[in-house]
Interface confidence: low
């Protein structure tokens, strides 16, 4: 029967991932043991690898919420073309049952005592509420149980008392004129304002509270003309140490405008608050090393074999780079000096080729010469062998990517009389002159 074929099996969830398509046989789908299949959409997902038991599922909830019950868990034989341990066919479930107890005892409801007395009214004048309470102890509930209904109830109450009126301040009156005409005299100039406890006045019977706080307030006068004082520079401070350990740096002296400080709108000190000097450590600065670009990959070879070209035999190749420019105890280059990779050699291998699409148009050449043209190409592109993209070279080192290397000999049918490259050229239009932008600005 045809099945749905997938490219991945997720061990943790037991789900099929990456649908490849339907209408294929299990045998064809499982030519790749990394694949998985389902007999119908949403059905059980089976991986193509040889069968083995899945992880145990989590335990199902306990069959009862209190006292002793039991709970199940399962695992499934998943895979294809074989049996799990115990000679069990794929798809078979194996169950485990264990005793469980979420809570030792089951809750029992309690009963209320009689209502207690009413508490005093919540206010001492006008209307409020009063409350009474009862206890859940007749009998007390067991094992986390409770009593039905509310533990307290409330009702309205009236004290039959008139509430007193408390005093509140009316708005402030205007400020009185200032007591002096300028700052800096023997007496600090002040202004005053007052307010009345009349919004409302406190009641007499029953007696209300008087207004809190003072009926008067004072403040310093603002906006009076001060006597301006011009600022003056203090002495130059010490020269700061040279801030660098190599090459040239800059030291600094500072002074402060505080002899005297400018006051009452007086002018700030004229001139600079800092001055700088060059300092020379006479020590060259370290220069860190920088990697050159990687060199060419060495030929793809395998030890003790004369040639592995045109064969599905992985080899190794390396490339190197040089750390240049390190001076005066600068940092060494970080990283590896040599890079090694696995490879298939296709050096001089005759490979079937196919013509590429047209490349994008290239740059106009020559850019500053007469009659520049641009070109595009179609290349005879080799069809690379379908060798495994990864190999396991040494036990325990995992899978390694394998790269094709070498100069194959692609073979394409002739196109416009060419076997390897077809080129089309066009003239470039409306070509501007090449001018040095620096000279244009002058």
């Amino acid at each position: 029967d045809p099945v749905l074929c997938f490219t991945q099996y997720e061990e943790s969830s037991g789900k099929c991932k990456g649908l490849l398509g339907g209408g294929v046989s299990v045998e064809d789908c499982c030519l790749n043991t990394a694949f998985a299949y389902q007999k119908r959409s949403g059905g059980l997902c089976q991986p193509c690898r040889s069968p083995r038991w899945s992880l145990w599922s989590t335990w199902a909830p306990c069959s009862v919420t209190c006292s002793e019950g039991s709970q199940l868990r399962y695992r499934r034989c998943v895979g294809w073309n074989g049996q799990c341990s115990g000679k069990v066919a794929p798809g078979t479930l194996e169950w485990q049952l264990q005793a469980c107890e979420d809570q030792q005892c089951c809750p029992e409801m309690g009963g209320w005592s009689g209502w207690g007395p009413w508490e005093p009214c919540s206010v001492t004048c006008s209307k409020g509420t009063r409350t009474r309470r009862r206890a859940c102890n007749h009998p007390a509930p067991k094992c986390g149980g409770h009593c039905p209904g509310q533990a307290q109830e409330s009702e309205a109450c009236d004290t039959q008392q008139v509430c007193p009126t408390h005093g509140a301040w009316a708005t402030w009156g205007p400020w009185t004129p200032c007591s002096a005409s300028c700052h800096g005299g023997p007496h600090e100039p002040k202004e005053t304002r007052s307010r009345k406890c009349s919004a409302p006045e406190p009641s007499q019977k029953p007696p209300g509270k008087p207004c809190p706080g003072l009926a008067y307030e004072q403040r310093r006068c603002t906006g009076l003309p001060p006597c301006p004082v011009a600022g003056g520079w203090g002495p130059w401070g010490p020269v700061s140490p040279c801030p660098v350990t190599c090459g040239l740096g800059q030291t600094m002296e500072q002074r402060t405008c505080n002899h005297p400080v400018p006051q009452h709108g007086g002018p700030f000190c004229a001139g600079d608050a800092t001055r700088t000097h060059i300092c020379n450590t006479a020590v060259p600065c370290p220069v860190d090393g920088e990697w050159d670009s990687w060199g060419e990959w060495s030929p793809c070879i395998r030890r003790n074999m004369k040639s592995i070209s045109c064969q599905e035999i992985p080899g190794q190749q390396s490339r190197g780079r040089t750390c240049r420019g390190r001076k005066f105890d600068g940092h060494r280059c970080a990283g590896q000096q040599q890079d090694i990779r696995h490879c298939y050699s296709i050096q001089h291998c005759p490979l079937k080729g196919s013509w590429s699409e047209w490349s994008t148009w290239g740059l106009c050449m020559p850019p500053c010469g007469p009659n520049p043209t641009r070109a595009r190409q179609r290349l005879c592109t080799p069809l690379l062998p379908k060798y495994p993209p990864t190999v396991s070279m040494v036990e325990g080192q995992g899978e390694k990517n394998v790269t094709f290397w070498g100069r194959p000999l692609p073979r394409c049918e002739e196109l416009q009389g060419q076997k390897l490259v077809v080129e089309e050229k066009r003239p470039c239009l409306h070509v501007p002159a090449c001018k040095d932008p620096e000279e244009e600005e002058l």
Epitope: E296, L379, F404
Partner: nanobody
Framework: QVQVVESGGGLRQTGGSLRLSCTAS????????MAWYRQAPGKQRELVAE???????VYADSVKGRFTISRDSAKNTVTLQMNSLKSEDTAVYYC?????????????WGQGTQVTVSS
Amino acid sequence: QVQVVESGGGLRQTGGSLRLSCTASGRIFEVNMMAWYRQAPGKQRELVAEISRVGTTVYADSVKGRFTISRDSAKNTVTLQMNSLKSEDTAVYYCNALQYDRYGGAEYWGQGTQVTVSS
């Protein structure tokens, strides 16, 4: 367009020496392989010597020990030093430049330079 230009051909006595040079120029990116091929009258074109960008060399059995190929990758130039010339070395020598990566390649040929070895 990429141009491949050879120079240095000529007439030599048996046992003599000759040095061929070749430059690839124009719209050229990195040249992976550069090689010398030759074609004697009435024969197929055959590989003489080849050198990769990193300097790996391949020689035809008939020229091993007598010819040396070298190149300047930065300038895309290749040189063939031919010593102990034999009459069977007489042929038109063609320079070949190959640009190649995982996705395709393009091969460029020079016009050829005549080498004649007389006894």
